[in-house]
């Protein structure tokens, strides 16, 4: 598989980590999250051309079949390979609590 | 998250397991796999509308941000949640070997 910088479609166009700034209102969290007021959401965005960051054998198969049957089989998709934890300060019935979410921020990406 | 049958876009249009019949030639495996000659490839195909089979918090965030910034943030993507193992009989330098691949056939799907 090609490495993350070797995008055949041009620099930065293939599957990689992006940061999107989002407020609690954007996320629909304003009524239950106190802090942070704004989240730097890291997510996986970009194209998955042939064998680029292929996660596994399934992704390789998907690439082959997409080439043969593009109307039936979609190209692999850019998704998180792992996550970074994030702490949210939440409102509770009794006050405030700290909650760690392990599946909120993408850490790195692959195609599947 | 809605269950797998409750697709708001119409029956069978949302993220679910599909089977695609593929020959070794289709997969580009003809020179190293002896058997099976044909593979029933199970893969995840379909749309991921709002909160449908959302895999985790990240998927929920992605849905929210896609609604706000559809040109920047893609909708969640239908990918395997788990896999079924598959045995391939391969040609090796010394003869023939059995190899079990744990990441070849999708077992069930979710949106991420």
């Amino acid at each position: 598989a090609r490495n993350g910088d070797d995008c055949p479609l041009g620099p930065g166009r293939c599957c990689r980590l992006h940061t999107v700034r989002a407020s609690l209102e954007d996320l629909g969290w304003a009524d239950w999250v106190l802090s942070p007021r704004e989240v730097q959401v890291t997510m996986c965005i970009g194209a998955c051309p042939s064998q680029f960051r292929a996660a596994n054998m399934h992704a390789q198969i998907k690439t082959s079949l997409h080439r043969l049957k593009p109307d039936t089989v979609p190209a692999p998709c850019c998704v998180p390979a792992s996550y970074n934890p994030m702490v949210l300060i939440q409102k509770t019935d009794t006050g405030v609590s700290l909650q760690t979410y392990d599946d909120l921020l993408a850490k790195d990406c692959h195609c599947i | 998250a809605r269950n797998g049958d409750d697709c708001p876009l119409g029956p069978g249009r949302c993220c679910r397991l599909h089977t695609v019949r593929a020959s070794l030639e289709d997969l580009g495996w003809a020179d190293w796999v002896l058997s099976p000659r044909e593979v029933q490839v199970t893969m995840c195909i379909g749309a991921c509308p709002s909160q449908f089979r959302a895999a985790n918090m990240h998927a929920q965030i992605k849905t929210s941000l896609h609604r706000l910034k559809p040109d920047t943030v893609p909708a969640p993507c239908c990918v395997p949640a788990s896999y079924n193992p598959m045995v391939l009989i391969q040609k090796t330098d010394t003869g023939v070997s059995l190899q079990t691949y744990d990441d070849l056939l999708a077992k069930d799907c979710h949106c991420i």
């Epitope: - | 003809a30 002896l34 058997s35 099976p36 029933q40 045995v87 009989i89």
Partner: antibody, heavy 119, light 111 residues
Framework: DVKLVESGEGLVKPGGSLKLSCAAS????????MSWVRQTPEKRLEWVAY????????YYADTVKGRFTISRDNARNTLYLQMSSLKSEDTAMYYC????????????WGQGTTLTVSS | DSVLTQSPASLLVSLGQRATISCRAS??????????MHWYQQKPGQPPKLLIK???YLESGVPARFSGSGSGTDFTLNIHPVEEEDAATYYC?????????FGGGTKLEIK
């Protein structure tokens, strides 16, 4: 060690039914396809039925189609062959075999179980 | 269906000599890459045992005196030098497509 142990042998009248079982051990049963192969009294080998690892692909020899049903229980590591409308020509030694995948070979065989169809 | 015809039906070979068994398919059991023909040995009171897979690949643990060759419709099993323990019936089998079929068998006797 891979072991396949058949059971269910019997003497059955023509038109009768019988179910054969095969208990598998020593390998990950759910990862492999399985087949039944029979050997006639004249020592001819005949492939009878095939079932894929997950049970979703099933094939039969024309001689048994519509009369025999192959199935498996991966939780119990057991292969089955339900036989009905039995004929005298079904008389044979029935072997449970590991067939690996489609287009493969039989790498392990059980010791066999005998079916006799006679009035 | 591909019908497999084995010849000879029986074979008497001297110890240390070569035994050659033929298997002919009524239609090709090969692709451009591989041949889907396999060979088994069966001794009295025992189930068949795999010897050769995909026409020429020796199964693990099988002595090197066994060899297989051929493609398309014509296949051969060779045993050289023949040993006493090789007395058995030999079967070919194809798996190119369903239904899988076996040859009628060749009984090898050693003198």
């Amino acid at each position: 060690d891979v072991k396949l142990v058949e059971s269910g042998e019997g003497l059955v009248k023509p038109g009768g039914s019988l179910k054969l079982s095969c208990a598998a051990s020593g390998f990950t049963f759910s990862s492999y396809a399985m087949s039944w192969v029979r050997q006639t009294p004249e020592k001819r080998l005949e492939w009878v039925a095939y079932i894929s690892s997950g049970g979703d692909n099933i094939y039969y020899a024309d001689t048994v189609k519509g009369r025999f049903t192959i199935s498996r229980d991966n939780a119990r590591n057991t292969l089955y062959l339900q036989m009905s409308s039995l004929k005298s020509e079904d008389t044979a030694m029935y072997y449970c075999t590991r067939a690996l995948v489609e287009n493969a070979y039989f790498d392990y065989w059980g010791q066999g179980t005998t079916l006799t169809v006679s009035s | 269906d591909s019908v497999l015809t084995q010849s000879p039906a029986s074979l008497l070979v001297s110890l240390g000599q070569r035994a050659t068994i033929s298997c002919r398919a009524s239609k090709s059991v090969s692709t451009s890459t591989y041949s889907y023909m396999h060979w088994y040995q069966q001794k009295p009171g025992q189930p068949p045992k795999l010897l050769i897979k995909y026409a020429s690949y020796l199964e693990s643990g099988v002595p090197a005196r066994f060899s297989g060759s051929g493609s398309g419709t014509d296949f051969t099993l060779n045993i050289h030098p023949v040993e006493e323990e090789d007395a058995a019936t030999y079967y070919c089998q194809h798996s190119r497509e369903f239904p899988w079929t076996f040859g009628g068998g060749t009984k090898l006797e050693i003198k």
